[in-house]
Structures are given as C-alpha cells and as structure tokens.
Interface confidence: low
C-alpha cells in the first residue's frame, strides 16, 4: 500500500532503518490544505523513487483539476547536475517552487488565494536522459480556500403585477448566510437559492415581493465574518416605477 | 530495529468499545502511514484505515468509518485504533502496519461476547 | 470498490512442483502516471502476519527467493511458485494497492500432499 501512497520525505532516506526496502516511486501529499482568500498557501508534496542517485535532467509539473489530464498551473526544470529548477510557466504569475526537486521535494507556493482557486492540485517528476522515468501524484491535495462573505450584488427588479423583487448575492466559504431586513419584514432568510453549480461559493437570496417602501439590507454571514448591502425602494405613486 | 509492538487480548461485551495501541519504534514516526488491517477467524485480511501522524491525516474504508477512529500521539510514538458499538462480528486480529518497511505488529484478539 | 477475485481457493502440492494461482481486479490496477501496477502478493502463515512478497505486480522484495514470479498486467495477474518447499505451506492474498479502499482476495491456500 505504502508503496503507492505513503510517500515520504527526503530526510528519511537518511534515518537508519536496516529492513528498509529499495526505495520505490511514491508521493506523499496531504488530503487539504486550507488557507484564506487573500492569503497564500503552501501545497506539500515530497517523493521517493527508486533511482537512488539520479543526478539527470528533471521537471516538476503542478496541475490542477485531475491527475494527468488537467491544465497545469505551474512548470519547471532543472538541468544535469543544477539544483536550480527554473520557471517555465506560473499561472498568473501566483505560483512558485519551495522545495528542491533534487531533495524530492515538488512543494509549492500559491500567492494571493482567491476562491477561484479552490479546487485540487496534483504534482509530478519527470526524469530524462539516461533515465526515463516519471510519476504524478493520483490524488492529490484539496486546496480549501476560506472567505469572509461579500456582497457581490444587490438589486431591486420588476415583477409581475407592478411588484416589485429584491435580490442580493454573496459570495464566501463557506457559503454565507443571508437574511434581508427592511420594512415591515423583521429578520428574513427569504427565499435562498442553493449555490448553483460550478459557482459554489455564491448564494442568493430573494424577496419576491416588496410591499413597502424603504430601506432593505441584506446580511450576509459566515464563520469569517458579516457583510451588509443595502437597496432603497421608493415607489412613485401612481406609477409603476421605482427609484433604487 | 523497526518494531511495532501491539496491546494485548482483549474480551469485550457487546455494544461496549475498546481501544487498541500500537508501539513503534526504530524509525521517524511522524513520517509513514500506520494502516490497520482487520482479519476475522479463518478469513481473508480487510483494509480498516491509516493514519500520517505527522499531522494527524486518516483515510478511511468506508465500511468502518463509523466502526472505527484512529489517532496517534507523537510523544509516544503509538497508534490507536478505537472500536465502537462492538458485535461479534467485530470478533477478529486487527493488525498494524507500516507497508513502507512491511512491518506488520504481531497482532491484537479482539473477542466479542457477553 | 476494487474487487479481487483469486482462484483457486485452495491448491494441493508435491515439494519440488511447479504452482500457478490467479488473481483479477474488478478494474484496472494499471497506473498511466508510470505505467506501474499497483498489485502486491502476500505470504501468510499460520498464527503470523502477512509478509509482502510482490509488488508492483512483478518486482521481488529484497530477501524473497527467486522462486516466487509474479505477472500480469491490469486486471489479470497471477503469482508463481516454481520448485514449492514445505517452507512455502500458507496462504496467499493479492491486494489492490491502487486506490481507497485497498482490497485484498480471500487468498488461495497452498497445502502439501
């Protein structure tokens, strides 16, 4: 089992364990790491292989989504003999190598976390010249990526039979809380709408009927912290329209 | 010498819950996975769980998720397997193991009875 | 979950013979990252615990005698003993090293006539 999974780091080819076997290929990444938008994060990972003195040319590769197939996220390569392992491709210019591949170590530093970044991440050598040999990590290490919530939109729409609806949006994880306020409403969730798929840090919250006019607000809140946005309903009267 | 040096027997009554150790040593314990491998009476070997006790990481079968919790204390060096809602089919060696080194621990009997 | 199926559940040997036994995964155990399969054979003995044997469906751990093969590719593999001593009398389990949860067959027992 361990062979495929247990994967461990590079100071342990050092300790003196007489039943140890020859080394095999293994990676060691954890389940999660999490870390807050805004911040940056570190996503370990640290190999064995079974060429005990490989010296060749090498690149480590980060990719993100699934194993093998997804796009990479970060690129770099050290030539024969180098401990340098120099950039060739850093997404956005986020990504940056904290290990030394040359130690078995692939570990990598992700700059100014956003929730976008939230998702998995798998790291793989590449060894070349006299030995051809590589190995990727199956799978891989959750980035988790927390968030305050914000309110990314608030607004007052049409409805039917000269309503009017209010909607407010925010984002955050874990997803946020939302509750509108305002006239004659109390504290209400209204109706929140499930984080639709492939934007699951957002969630929506509507009143479908506003009967007064006035100031709505609406909080959102999570275990990070609140945010509050307000929409102003002032309704002509007579007409149908609205001021907001 | 690696070594993993396991509890001794244990008779247990139904519904009650035990609590299993495993002693390493010879080796960085922070820095391998400990597995636990459950064999009934005359049967085949069951994949229960491991534990990284670097930082405490578990992966777990599903089958034994609510079986079964794992911990590790770094001041020790031991492993420990936790066993709930015990029945008899809970009746079994349960093993520990570093796959790494293929060391196995000799094994603790669990027997389930009233 | 990967399912292993091994055959026979049991194989009755003279010293000196030559033994094949078989094992099959539910699915491909064949890792494209490094073209590896992740099937390992185990030895146990009565009243001890398993020993590893194979790995990576084919490569001998330091210290087994060359007499154990093992072969195969994705989701058939089996496990040879040329020239069985009384010394190799246990039961044999396949186990998919793959992915979560690892399996393991219910073994095929080697006896001695």
């Known amino acids: 089992f361990v062979r495929t999974k247990i994967d461990t780091t590079e100071n342990l080819l050092n300790t003196e364990v007489h039943s140890s076997p020859a080394q095999r290929w293994s990676m060691q990444v954890p389940p999660e790491v999490s870390a807050e938008a805004g911040d940056a994060a570190v996503l370990p990972c640290t190999f064995t292989h079974p060429h005990r003195h490989y010296d060749g040319p090498l690149t480590a590769i980060w990719r993100a989504g699934e194993p093998y197939a997804g796009p990479q996220v970060f690129r770099c390569a050290a030539a024969r003999g180098s401990e340098l392992c120099q950039t060739a491709l850093s997404l956005h210019g986020r990504f940056r190598l904290l290990g030394n591949p040359r130690r078995n170590d692939l570990s990598l530093r992700v700059e100014r976390l956003a929730l976008a970044d939230d998702r998995r991440y798998f790291c793989r050598v590449e060894f070349a010249g006299d030995v051809h040999d590589r190995y990727e990590s199956r799978h891989g290490v959750r980035l988790h990526v927390t968030a305050a919530p914000r309110i990314v939109n608030i607004s007052v729409l049409p409805s039917p039979a000269h309503a009017f609806r209010a909607l407010c949006t925010a984002e955050g994880e874990p997803p946020p809380a939302l509750a509108w306020s305002g006239p004659a409403l109390g504290n209400s969730l209204a109706a929140v709408r499930s984080p639709r798929e492939g934007h699951g840090h957002l969630v929506t919250a509507e009143l479908p009927a506003l009967t007064h006019d006035g100031r709505y607000t609406c909080t959102a809140a999570n275990s990070l912290g609140r945010s509050e946005a307000s929409v102003y309903l002032f309704r002509f009267h007579g007409a149908s329209g609205a001021s907001t | 010498q690696v070594q993993l040096k396991q509890s001794g027997a244990e008779l247990v009554r139904p519904g009650a819950s035990v609590k299993l150790s495993c002693k390493a040593s010879g080796y960085t314990f922070t820095d391998y996975y400990i597995n636990w491998v459950k064999q009934r009476p005359g049967q085949g070997l069951e994949w229960i769980a491991r534990?990284?006790?670097?930082?405490?990481?578990?992966d777990y079968n599903e089958k034994f998720k609510d079986k079964a919790t794992l911990t590790a204390e770094k001041s020790s060096t031991t492993a420990y397997i936790q066993l709930s809602s015990l029945t008899s089919e809970d009746s079994a060696v349960y093993f520990c193991?570093?796959?790494?080194?293929?060391?196995w621990g000799t094994g603790t009997t669990v027997t389930v009875s009233s | 979950d990967i399912v292993m199926t091994q055959s026979p559940s049991s194989l009755t040997v003279t010293a000196g013979e030559k033994v094949t036994m078989s094992c099959k995964s539910s699915q491909s155990l064949l890792n494209s990252g490094n073209q590896k399969n992740y099937l390992t054979w185990y030895q146990q003995k009565p009243g001890q615990p398993p020993k590893l044997l194979i790995y990576?469906?084919?490569t001998r751990e330091s210290g087994v005698p060359d007499r154990f093969t093992g072969s195969g590719s994705g989701t058939d593999f089996t496990l040879t003993i040329s020239n069985v001593q009384p010394e190799d009398l246990a039961v044999y389990y396949c186990?998919?090293?793959?992915?979560?949860?690892?399996?393991f067959g219910s073994g095929t027992e080697l006896e001695m006539k």
């Open positions: 534990i990284y006790p670097g930082n405490g990481n578990t």
């Open positions: 990576w469906a084919s």
């Open positions: 186990q998919n090293d793959y992915s979560f949860p690892f399996t």
């Open positions: 193991c570093l796959w790494y080194f293929d060391v």
